[in-house]
């Protein structure tokens, strides 16, 4: 049993840091491996992550952390029994990847105006909480080719766009990701998409000029 | 919400020891580390030492490394420090604090243990 | 050991203003800087932990920041309960140490 690509990992930069790795043939990662980490610190305490399987010889574990600061360094075992497969080290700080925004919501009740907000994944007492930023994926499920991205780089969690800049009497979804500069993370995951019909009544001048074409 | 009981006040003799507990309301005592710290009085805050007690590991200041001994019984989530050799500089009101594992910072302190050394 | 000097020794601000306490160690921390306050007769509590972050349950008044050797707690707008003895605390190498204490007091 080897370990054909070894383990990267990436945290939350809060309470979980995923690490994923590839062996080098089908194995049940539950029953056969185990990811030993610890923080490199005085009286710090060794932990055991039980990996799940990631396709036929991946594995993903999902390491539990009390707290990340950004000098926390990890070392990392891997053990098939009493064998070490690979040994390694991981700064959580240096390979974010941010929790995913949530409960995305389009508020159409304004007149010609979209409003699209969505929370922040942290708590505010979280390092990130104050240094997201965000894009905005909005696209046509009827046109693939109308699909576009809005950058969102100041830190409230929301952005309004003219109804009119999207084709009116379709529908559109939405989705959200995150990321923060500070730490040069990776963007998040996508949030979940929400979905949308747009309808706008088009100023009579608009209407009546585009009648003449 | 984490609380730390210690034991009562002290009134030793110099060369005598004593030896004081801190009994910690947390569901796993192995997730932390008691660490023992003393005030003088009027004076400030010096860190005595510190154990983890799932693995019994201890660093100690060099200061106290020969007279003070750190261990817990993880049974009933209790620390003990026991100081030996006692001078009336050892006056002090003692503190246990928690810190989860591995940390540096003080998280939840115990009301103290005045010990008081006197001929 | 590192040497931690906090200033100033004491202070008295009135209710509102803005407090600032330093703390100074004898060589790099790298950040593993605490704050603690403490009232009289009672045990220190736990305000800002690793520089400046909030520990649970502290008024957002409380902040902190520096870097390397230098550090500084602040109060935005004082209290008449955020009287008390401040004291900072190194834990990057040992011996852990603190620093001499600042009494904050009400003019």
């Known amino acids: 049993m080897k370990v054909l690509q070894e383990p990267t990992c990436v945290s939350d930069y809060m309470s979980i840091s995923t690490c994923e790795w590839k062996m080098n043939g089908p194995t049940n990662c539950s029953t056969e491996l185990r990811l030993l980490y610890q923080l490199v610190f005085l009286l710090s305490e060794a932990h055991t992550c039980i990996p799940e399987n990631n396709g036929g010889a991946g594995c993903v574990c999902h390491l539990l952390m009390d707290d990340v600061v950004s000098a926390d360094n990890y070392t990392l075992d891997l053990w098939a029994g009493q064998q070490l497969l690979w040994k390694g080290s991981f700064k959580p700080s240096e390979h974010v990847k941010p929790r995913a925004p949530g409960n995305l919501t389009v508020h159409t009740n304004v007149s010609d105006t979209l409003l699209l907000t969505w929370s922040n994944p942290y708590p505010p007492d979280n390092y990130l909480y104050n240094h997201l930023t965000y894009a905005v994926n909005i696209w046509s499920e009827n046109d693939p080719a109308d699909f576009r991205i809005y950058n969102v780089t100041y830190l409230e969690p929301s952005l309004r766009i003219a109804a009119s800049t999207l084709k009116s009497g379709i529908s559109y979804r939405a989705r959200v990701r995150a990321w923060a500069q500070c730490y040069n993370t990776t963007w998040s995951e996508w949030s979940p998409s929400t979905k949308w019909h747009n309808s706008y009544r088009e100023p009579f001048e608009q209407h009546h000029h585009h009648h003449h074409h | 919400q984490v609380q730390l009981v210690q034991s009562g006040a002290e009134v030793k003799k110099p060369g005598a020891s004593v030896k004081m507990s801190c009994k910690a309301s947390v569901y796993t005592f192995t997730g932390y580390n008691m660490h023992w710290v003393r005030q003088a009085p009027g004076q400030g805050l010096e860190w005595i030492g510190g154990l983890h007690p799932g693995n019994g590991d201890t660093s100690y200041n060099q200061k106290f490394k020969d007279r003070a001994t750190l261990t817990a019984d993880r049974s009933s989530n209790t620390a003990y420090m026991e100081l030996s050799s006692l001078r009336s500089e050892d006056t002090a009101v003692y503190y246990c604090?928690?810190?989860?594992?591995?940390?540096?910072?003080?998280?939840?302190w115990g009301q103290g243990t005045l010990v008081t050394v006197s001929s | 050991d590192i040497q931690m000097t906090q200033s100033p020794s004491s202070l008295s601000a009135s209710v509102g203003d803005r407090v600032t306490i330093t703390c100074q160690a004898s060589q790099d921390i790298s950040n593993y800087l605490n704050w603690y306050q403490q009232k009289p007769g009672k045990a220190p509590k736990l305000l800002i932990y690793y520089t400046s972050r909030l520990h649970s349950g502290v008024p957002s008044r409380f902040s902190g920041s520096g870097s390397g050797t230098d550090y500084t707690f602040t109060i935005s707008s004082l209290q008449p309960e955020d009287i008390a003895t401040y004291f900072c605390q190194q834990g990057n190498t040992l011996p852990w140490t603190f620093g001499g204490g600042t009494k904050v007091e009400i003019k």
């Open positions: 604090a928690l810190t989860t594992a591995g940390r540096a910072w003080f998280a939840y």
